[in-house]
């Protein structure tokens, strides 16, 4: 059964069905995903029957015997097995299945086997954090404060306002407040808010592939908590980064270079920060945020170390009462410790039980919040440090990083160049753009201590080879060594082509496989503007008129008539601030009408042709879907 004999409508349904089963989004259905599908669908079937059906589907569907079902094989299953019991059960399972959670993971208290389980502890922690964060926001009075002991949270996120606000607290200025619908909400304006929240979450690097507006509207607990955790974590980690917090250099160890320290993730830096203070207190180090902190002793000493000593003007001393250390009962000791944390204004995220159970997620959040409030680090006067090497990432680098993370690459990319030095993330991105990777050729970690870099270099060579031969990228003068060493210009050249191809692939899928290039996008933009009787047009993605954002705003209004409030815009003789104001509105409005835009307002103002292209391409995708 060739794709050609499937109608467009049926193809859309099949794609949707396939995406429901392919929960990890890698383009293939595995045995486990089939198993999970039947569990999640809650069909009245005994375990052995589920196993039989799954095995049957794998046996008949996996035509090339690679242990997984591709989309083409999936089409054949649907057509070839229409009448059988197995196929009927399979279809029923897909139809019954609600959004399977593919975020993060379950917490320590929940389990793999239960699809809809969620952590009460997380809910309690997040509600208290959000209540505190939004307590003075007039737009949230209708839901704040939420009761942490009820399902308030899952109802509160349903209109999108709280999510938008939390995203802006984590990464300020992500969402233009003017675009949030706040009054007299209707199902349509709620949908817009949820689009805005989800697309903005994606733009700050949240992995939201398997979360839809419906899931949030319905308040599906595991999806809501998964998204909130990502948003909260991004906010907590924002300053745990060397270029934004130079005092972290105090954590440099003997014989270590600044470069080594810069490669550490926020989690690793936090652990190192805690151990730096524990060492100063003459205590044992901790190796994790779970079992090693269960007795609260490390926390006691950490609080004592970071508490203000009264040597800073306007910051009164806080003397930590250490008597609770003598408590025999773990829970009691944890409670006493948290009372001391409260005196620092840092009793957040964990209860005494969370400490004693060693809940890693919530303990990480507790420590991150403590770090943000009381880092207690001093920038060393050591002259050997090359401060020039501390420059932060560029906007473009951050956009690329957020794009990768939003696609769910593993592990998360914290530092663009060092985290790509073994090419593993690049291989995952190739898979996302439908370039097949032979994983047998890839060296996988853990890498040996001796010759480890050689293994990484081999990966990088293969990544460049795939780019040239399979993806047909223009990679003249780029070798594996450039990726391995983190050559900025050459690494960015490859990443840009990956992002461009990803964007064009989405457009081509919507357009039924028709090839797309820059000229086609520009023509579509102008044609759409003309049909909507808009006066603006663009000659290319370098057109200076784009700096006003008016072509983008007009296009949004053409795609969704009446969506743009032109009273908020400056249209003539714009100065830089006015251009930025228009651009902020344009980017948020694009996300609000459903376009997954990663570009930043500054990209429009500066007419960065690469990012401008992605904006128009995403809008074109949105416009074509509407037709």
């Amino acid at each position: 059964m060739a794709r050609g004999s499937v109608s467009d409508e049926e193809m859309m349904e099949l794609r949707e069905a396939f995406a429901k089963v392919d929960t990890d989004g890698n383009g293939y259905i595995s045995f486990n995903e089939l198993n999970d599908l039947f569990k999640a669908a809650c069909l009245p079937l005994p375990g052995y029957r589920v196993r039989e059906i799954t095995e049957n589907l794998m046996a008949t569907g996996d035509l090339d015997q690679d242990g997984r079902i591709s989309f083409d094989e999936f089409i054949k299953i649907f057509h070839g097995l229409k009448s059988t019991d197995v196929a009927k059960t399979f279809r029923k399972a897909i139809n019954k299945k609600e959004g399977i959670c593919a975020i993060g993971g379950t917490s320590e208290q929940s389990s793999v086997g239960t699809q809809h389980s969620y952590s009460e502890e997380e809910k309690y922690a997040f509600v208290n954090w959000i209540n505190k964060a939004l307590e003075n926001d007039p737009d949230c009075r209708h839901v704040i404060p939420m009761n942490p002991n009820t399902n308030d949270l899952f109802n509160a996120v349903g209109d999108g306002i709280v999510l938008c606000k939390m995203i802006n607290l984590s990464v300020p200025d992500t969402i233009d407040e003017r675009t949030i619908n706040k009054k007299k909400l209707t199902p349509f304006t709620i949908q817009e808010n949820l689009n805005l929240a989800l697309n903005s979450a994606s733009a700050i690097g949240c992995h939201v592939v398997n979360i839809g507006a419906e899931d949030l509207k319905e308040g599906k607990p595991y999806l809501v908590l998964g998204l909130l955790w990502q948003v909260i974590k991004i906010g907590l980690f924002a300053d745990i980064e060397l270029s934004r917090n130079e005092a972290l250099i105090a954590l440099l160890r003997e014989g270590e270079s600044l470069e080594d320290l810069m490669k550490l993730s926020p989690e690793e830096l936090l652990l190192r920060w805690a151990n730096y203070h524990l060492e100063n207190a003459g205590c044992n180090k901790i190796g994790n945020f779970s079992t090693d902190i269960k007795d609260s002793k490390a926390y006691y000493h950490l609080l004592e170390q970071v508490a203000p000593k009264g040597d800073e003007e306007g910051v009164p001393a806080v003397v930590i009462d250490m008597s609770g250390l003598r408590e025999k009962d773990d829970i009691q000791r944890a409670e006493c410790m948290l009372q001391q944390a409260e005196r620092l204004g840092c009793r957040q995220f964990v209860t005494a039980t969370d400490v004693v159970r060693g809940n890693p997620k919530l303990n990480l959040a507790f420590i991150a919040n403590l770090f943000n409030r009381y880092p207690a680090l001093h920038k060393p006067e050591n002259q050997d440090i090359d401060w020039g090497a501390l420059e932060g990432e560029t906007r473009e680098e951050r956009t690329f990083r957020n794009w990768m993370n939003s696609l769910g690459v593993n592990p998360r990319v914290n530092h663009l160049y060092s985290d790509l030095s073994d090419a593993l993330v690049i291989f995952q991105l190739y898979e996302k753009i439908k370039v097949p990777v032979d994983w047998n050729r890839v060296n996988k970690p853990p890498y040996p201590k001796l010759g480890g870099n050689m293994k990484k270099l081999e990966n990088c060579n293969y990544a460049v080879e795939l780019g040239k031969n399979q993806a047909k990228f223009s990679l003249v003068g780029i070798g594996g060594q450039d990726l391995n060493e983190g050559n900025r210009t050459l690494t960015l050249a490859l990443i840009w082509q990956l992002m461009r191809r990803y964007t064009l692939n989405i457009l081509e899928e919507i357009g039924g496989g028709q090839k797309v290039n820059d000229d086609i996008i520009v023509n579509w933009v102008n044609e759409t503007l003309r049909e909507a009787k808009k006066s603006s047009s663009i000659s290319s993605f370098k057109d200076p008129k784009i700096s006003t954002s008016l072509p983008v705003l007009d296009l949004i209004d053409a795609i969704q008539p009446g969506s743009i409030n032109y009273d908020l815009l400056k249209t003539e003789n714009l100065n830089d601030d006015e251009k930025l104001n228009n651009a902020k509105y344009a980017i948020s409005m694009a996300r609000k009408i459903g376009a997954r835009v990663y570009a930043l307002p500054e990209d429009l103002v500066e007419v960065n042709p690469k990012m401008v292209m992605t904006v128009f391409a995403c809008l074109m995708g949105k416009g074509m879907k509407r037709v």
Epitope: D24, N26, S30, F31, N32, E33, G67, G104, G105, T106, S107, E108, V112, S265, E267, E268, N288, F289, S290, P360, K361, L364, G408, N410, P411, L424, Q428, K444, P445, P446, Y447, P448, K449, L450, G452
Partner: nanobody, 124 residues
């Protein structure tokens, strides 16, 4: 050559505890997820627990939830599985394995490197 080495197995009475440890020799765990699996005689390999590279996201099989705790120490490059309230049905050879992508932590087929295993026997 990188090798995973499990330790801590043994023969214990039902209701007691054990702590298994997985160490990497010749390399460092770095940013890889680590899972524990077990195989009882005549049975299929079964997922037990897993932890992502940072130790923050943990996963458990229903059968061990609340009794077993997985944690990792990235300074020592070890991943521990603390097993409490052991039952005779927990008897098996326990293996640790690494998976850098960690998209499907419960799926043994996704894991890249495996240890030799350590025997756990729980008598009633």
């Amino acid at each position: 050559q990188v090798q995973l080495q499990e330790s801590g197995g043994g023969l214990v009475q039902a209701g007691s505890s054990l702590r298994l440890s997985c160490a990497v020799s010749g390399g460092t765990f770095g940013r890889v997820g680590v899972g524990w699996f077990r195989r009882a005689p005549g049975k299929e390999r079964e997922f037990v627990a897993a932890v992502n590279w940072s130790g923050i996201d943990t996963y458990y099989a229903d059968s061990v939830k609340g009794r077993f705790t997985i944690s990792r120490d990235n300074n020592k490059h070890t991943v521990d599985l603390r097993m409490n309230s052991l039952k005779p049905e927990d008897s098996a050879v326990y293996f640790c394995a690494t998976d850098f992508r960690f998209n499907a932590p419960m799926n043994g087929a996704e894991y890249d490197y495996w240890g030799q295993g350590t025997q756990v026997t729980v008598s009633s």
